[in-house]
C-alpha cells in the first residue's frame, strides 16, 4: 500500500478553501446587467427586491415597483410594458428544460397602482412577452398563441393546432430549444408591434424518449419527450406571421421556405425583424453545411410575405459545418437592406463581413489570425463587437468599436486597457442606440460591471465591483492560475493550469485533467472562478489542467473542423498529448494522474481512460454521451453526418465508449448519471455499464434519482461533489 500523502499549505495565516465553501456558494460573484428601457434609462432589481428605475442623465432613481407588491404574488421576475403603464409579475417558476419553464403571470397597472382584474391570464403560461410598443401581450398557453390588445382585454386566440408533445406554436420543441434556438420562445414581434412572427413545430412523427420519474408515489411517472436522435425523423417546421392589429380579418400568413432548402430535410435557424414590414429568416439544410438567409417583405396588395430569390444569401462550408456552434445572425444597418455578419473568411477565421447585395461581394470588415465572436450593436456610425484578437490569447474577450461612418472604417479597442490585469474577458449590454452601455468583466480578476458613455467610452459609474467577495477572499489561499500554450508538431494547444498555493516546481503533484472538448466549445478562458477544482488545488494540493484541443473554438476552422465527421478521435488524442507534455514539465507525479468531465467531457474522459496509454490512474465521467446515435439529431449530425451506411455509420459505431469496454480494465472508473436526464439520456451510461459488465470489467457507479443533466438540486449536488472528492482522494492516496 502506498503511504498516504497529505498536502499542507505552508505557514500562512490564510486558510485553504474547503469543499463546504464550494457547496455553499460562499465565494460566488455578482454581475450587473441593466434592463434597458430607453436610450438612457434602465431597470434593476435591488438586493431587497424593489424594482428600481435609473435615469443615467439626471442621475435619478425611482422605485417603480415595491418589494411588497412583488411579495404579494411571490414574484421572482418582472417585465415593464413599453408604454410603462403595466408590469407583468412572474411567479410559480417551474423549470422544464434548459431554457423553458412555465409560470403564473399577474399584470400590475402602475398608473392606477393595482392589479388588472378583468380577463386574468390562464395558468401556467409557457411564454409571455410585451409588444415592443404600447402594451399588447402575446403569450403561449397549452402550445397555442394568444394575443391581448391591452392587459384588461379578452384574449384573441391566434393558433388552434397546439397539442402537447405534438404541435408547438410560438415555443420550440425539445431539440430546437436545446440545439438550435437556445431560447424558450419561438415568436418575435415586429419593431412597431404590428406583426407577430412565430414558428410551428410539428413533432407528430418524432420518436419518443421515455424515462421513469420516481417521485414519491407508489408508481413512477413516465416522462415522454419527442426527441429525434441521430438519423431519426425531425420536427416539421413552418413560420407564420400574423397582423396583430386585425388578427381576425386575415389569419396567420405562412412565410415561404427557399427552394434550395425545401428540396430536402431542413431546419429553421433564426428570425430577425429588419423593419416594420421586412423580416429576415435563416434556414439550414439537415446536412448542416449550407445555410440560407432569406429577406422577406410584406406585400399589402397580396396580404402575403414575399421572399424574392435575389434576397436569398447562401453561406456554405466546404471543410465542416456552417457557422460556429450556431449559424451567426445578421446585424442590419439603418438602410434595412445591408447587414453585418460573422462567417469564415478565405483563411478559415470567423470575421465580420458587410453584405450589401450578395455574399460573393461581401466586404470583409475584420481580418487576422483571430476571430470576431459577436456583434453587439450596429448604429449609424459605429459597430460594436467582441473578439479574441488582443495579444493573441484565444480565451480572452475584448469589446471593439468600428467607426463605420469613417472611410476607411477605424477600429478601437474599448476594453483592452481598462483594467488590464483584472479584466480580460468582457461582455457588454447596450442601450437601444448605444448611447450608453454596461461592460461586464468576468475576470481573470474579480468580476466588475461598469457603465459607460457610448460616444466617448468614458466610464460613468461602477455598477458592481464585488467588494464583499474581495473582502471574504482576503484570508483564503487561492491557487495560482496560468494560461499558456504548448506546441506539438505543427499544433498549438492552449491550456489553463491551476497550481496549489506555495507551488514548488521541484516537488511532485497529482494531476487532474478537467475536460469538455466539444466542438466549438472553449475551456481555457481568462475568467474568475472559485469552484470544485479551485478547492482541489487549494486544499488538496492537486494540479488541475484544462486543455483546448482540436475541435474547440475561436482559433480558426482548420483547428475547429479537424473533428468533422470523426468525433472522439482528436479531442482525446490532444488531451493525451497535453498530459505527456505536462509530465515533461517535471512537477507531475505520473503515478497519480486523473481525468474527469461532464457531458461531452464525460465522453472524452471515458475515451481517454480507455485509450490504453496507461497515462491515467483513474477518472470520472458525469452524464457522458456514449454513442452519437443516442444523442440529438441536430447536434450529432452537425458534426458527424448521418448514421447511415452510405454516410458515416462506420464512425458512429467505432466512436462509442462501449466499443472500448475492455480498455477500462486497468483504470479506476467512476460513472455517474442522473436518471431523469432529458438531454444525455441515462441510456448512455446504462449502455456503458452493460458493456463493462459484459467485459467483466470492475468499475464504480453512482446514479442520481430524478436528477437531470445538471444534477443541480442542492442535496444531489452536495452528494455528487463529496462522492467525487472521496474517489479522487482515494485514487491519489490523499488522506481525508
Amino acid at each position: 500500500l502506498r503511504p498516504s500523502r497529505v498536502y499542507k499549505p505552508e505557514g500562512n495565516t490564510k486558510r485553504a478553501l474547503t469543499l463546504k465553501d464550494i457547496l455553499n456558494g460562499t465565494f460566488s460573484y455578482k454581475t450587473y446587467f441593466p434592463n434597458w428601457i430607453s436610450e438612457q434609462e434602465y431597470l434593476h432589481q435591488s438586493e431587497d427586491d424593489n424594482i428600481v428605475f435609473y435615469n443615467i442623465e439626471t442621475r435619478e432613481s425611482y422605485i417603480i415597483l415595491s418589494n411588497s407588491t412583488m411579495k404579494s404574488v411571490n414574484a421572482t421576475d418582472y417585465g415593464l410594458s413599453p408604454d410603462r403603464q403595466f408590469v407583468y409579475l412572474e411567479s410559480d417558476y417551474s423549470k422544464l428544460w434548459r431554457y423553458s419553464y412555465t409560470a403564473t403571470y399577474y399584470i400590475y397597472d402602475l398608473q392606477n397602482g393595482e392589479f388588472v382584474r378583468g380577463y386574468e391570464l390562464p395558468r401556467p403560461i409557457q411564454y409571455l412577452c410585451w409588444s415592443p410598443v404600447g402594451s399588447k401581450l402575446a403569450y403561449v398557453y397549452q402550445n397555442n398563441i394568444y394575443l391581448k390588445q391591452r392587459p384588461g382585454d379578452p384574449p384573441f386566440q391566434i393558433t388552434y393546432t397546439g397539442r402537447e408533445n405534438r404541435i408547438f406554436n410560438g415555443i420550440p420543441d425539445w431539440v430546437y430549444e436545446e440545439e438550435m434556438l437556445a431560447t424558450k420562445y419561438a415568436l418575435w414581434w415586429s419593431p412597431d408591434g404590428k406583426f407577430l412572427a412565430y414558428v410551428e413545430f410539428n413533432d407528430s412523427d418524432i420518436p419518443i424518449i421515455a424515462y421513469s420519474y420516481y417521485g414519491d408515489g407508489q408508481y413512477p411517472r413516465t416522462i415522454n419527450i419527442p426527441y429525434p436522435k441521430a438519423g431519426a425523423k425531425n420536427p416539421v417546421v413552418r413560420v407564420f406571421i400574423v397582423d396583430t392589429t386585425y388578427p381576425h380579418h386575415v389569419g396567420p400568413m405562412e412565410v415561404p421556405v427557399p427552394e434550395m432548402i425545401a428540396s430536402s430535410d431542413y431546419y429553421f435557424s433564426w428570425l430577425t425583424w429588419v423593419s416594420s414590414e421586412r423580416v429576415c429568416l435563416q434556414w439550414l439544410k439537415r446536412v448542416q453545411n449550407v445555410s440560407v438567409l432569406s429577406i422577406c417583405d410584406f406585400r399589402e396588395d397580396w396580404h402575403a410575405w414575399e421572399c424574392p430569390k435575389n434576397q436569398e444569401h447562401v453561406e456554405e462550408s466546404r471543410t465542416g459545418w456552417a457557422g460556429g456552434f450556431f449559424v451567426s445572425t445578421p446585424a442590419f444597418s439603418q438602410d434595412a437592406t445591408s447587414y453585418y455578419k460573422i462567417f469564415s473568411d478565405k483563411d478559415g477565421y470567423k470575421h465580420i463581413h458587410y453584405i450589401k447585395d450578395t455574399v460573393e461581394n461581401a466586404i470583409q470588415i475584420t481580418s487576422g489570425k483571430w476571430e470576431a465572436i459577436y456583434i453587439f450593436r450596429v448604429t449609424q456610425d459605429s459597430l460594436f463587437y467582441s473578439s479574441n484578437e488582443f495579444e493573441g490569447y484565444p480565451g480572452r474577450r475584448n469589446i471593439y468599436r468600428i467607426s463605420i461612418g469613417n472611410s476607411p472604417p477605424s477600429k478601437k479597442c474599448v476594453t483592452c486597457h481598462l483594467r488590464k490585469e483584472r479584466c480580460q474577458y468582457y461582455t457588454a449590454s447596450f442601450s437601444y442606440k448605444a448611447k450608453y452601455y454596461a461592460l461586464v468583466c468576468y475576470g481573470p480578476g474579480l468580476p466588475i460591471s461598469t457603465l459607460h458613455d457610448g460616444r466617448t467610452d468614458q466610464e460613468i459609474q461602477v455598477l458592481e465591483e464585488n467588494k464583499e467577495l474581495e473582502n471574504s477572499l482576503r484570508n483564503i489561499q487561492l491557487p495560482k492560475v496560468e494560461i499558456k500554450k504548448l506546441k506539438d508538431g505543427g499544433l498549438t494547444f492552449w491550456y489553463k493550469m491551476i497550481l496549489p498555493p506555495q507551488f514548488d516546481r521541484s516537488k511532485k503533484y497529482p494531476l487532474l485533467i478537467q475536460v469538455y472538448g466539444g466542438p466549438c466549445s472553449q475551456s481555457v478562458k481568462s475568467v474568475f472562478a472559485v469552484n470544485w477544482i479551485t478547492y482541489l488545488a487549494s486544499k488538496e494540493g492537486i494540479v488541475i489542467a484544462l486543455v483546448d484541443g482540436r475541435g474547440t473554438a475561436f482559433q480558426g476552422d482548420k483547428f475547429l473542423h479537424a473533428v468533422y465527421r470523426k468525433l472522439g478521435v482528436y479531442e482525446v488524442e490532444d488531451q493525451l498529448t497535453a498530459v505527456r507534455k505536462f509530465i515533461e514539465m517535471g512537477f507531475i507525479d505520473e503515478e497519480r494522474i486523473a481525468i474527469w468531465g461532464w457531458s461531452y467531457g464525460g465522453y472524452v474522459s471515458s475515451l481517454a481512460l480507455a485509450s490504453g496509454t496507461g497515462l491515467f490512474k483513474c477518472g470520472i465521467a458525469v452524464a457522458p454521451v456514449s454513442s452519437w446515435e443516442y444523442y440529438a439529431s441536430i447536434y450529432s449530425e452537425r458534426f458527424m453526418g448521418l448514421p447511415t451506411k452510405d454516410d458515416n455509420l462506420e464512425h458512429y459505431k467505432n466512436s462509442t465508449v462501449m466499443a472500448r469496454a475492455e480498455y477500462f480494465r486497468n483504470v479506476d472508473y467512476l460513472l455517474i448519471h442522473g436518471t431523469a436526464d432529458d438531454n444525455v439520456h441515462f441510456q448512455n451510461s446504462a449502455q456503458i455499464a452493460k458493456a463493462l459488465v459484459n467485459a467483466q470489467v470492475d468499475f464504480q457507479a453512482m446514479w442520481y434519482s430524478d436528477q437531470n443533466h445538471g444534477i443541480s438540486s442542492g442535496r444531489s449536488q452536495n452528494h455528487l461533489y463529496t462522492h467525487m472528492t472521496h474517489f479522487l482522494k482515494q485514487c491519489f492516496s490523499l488522506s481525508d
Epitope: 442621475r59 435619478e60 417603480i64 408604454d83 410603462r84 402602475l110
Partner: antibody, heavy 119, light 107 residues
Amino acid sequence: QVQLQESGPGLVKPSETLSLTCTVSGFSLTNYDINWIRQPPGKGLEWIGLIWTGGGTNYNPSLKSRVTISKDTSKNQFSLKLSSVTAADTAVYYCVRGGPLVWYALDYWGQGTLVTVSS
Amino acid sequence: DIQMTQSPSSLSASVGDRVTITCKASQDVSTAVAWYQQKPGKAPKLLIYSASYRYTGVPSRFSGSGSGTDFTFTISSLQPEDIATYYCQQHYSNPRTFGGGTKVEIK
C-alpha cells in the same frame, strides 16, 4: 387616491417672496418628481421647475435667480419660493406630479391656487 | 429653450367631427411630447404621453402621433364634453415647454 394640494397666501406684495406649499398623498415619493407650473389669468402654461426624487432641482432659466423648490419628505410636503415678485407673477400656481412611468410628463395636477401680486 | 409652436390657436367643429391639432418643436425631441386637456377653471389633465401613449382612463377617441419635430393630436369623433383648451408639451429636456394652446369649440 392620488392627491396634491397647494396652499399659501392668495395675495403677495410686489418685491416680497411668494411661498407655497404642496401636500401630497396617495403615492410614494420614491416614484415621482414634483413640478411647479403656473398659468397667468387667460394665458398659457409655464413650467417653473421641479424637484427630483433624490432632492436635486431643475429650474426654468427665466426664473432661476428667484426660485427655490424644496421638500420635507417626512411631512410629504414640497415648497415653492419665488422672490422679488412683480405683477407679472400673478398666476394660478399648480403643484404637479411627474415621473419616469409617463416619460416625465405631468400626470396628476393639484387644483391650483391663485396668487395675486398687488400692493 | 425648445419652442413648441401649436396650431391652430382655436377651432370650431361639429359633434362627431375629426379634429386635428399640430405641434412643431424647434428641435428634435424624439417622442417626448405630451398633450393635456384643460377645461375652464380646472387644472389640466394628461391625455397623451410620449407622443402616442394614451394615459390610463383616457377614451380611445383621443390619439397622438409623431416623432422628431412634428406631432399631431387627434380627436376621432368630437363629443360635447371635449370642449376645452388643449396644450402640447415637450418633456424631452429642461426647461419643459408648452405650446400656446388650442381652444376647441362646438359649432
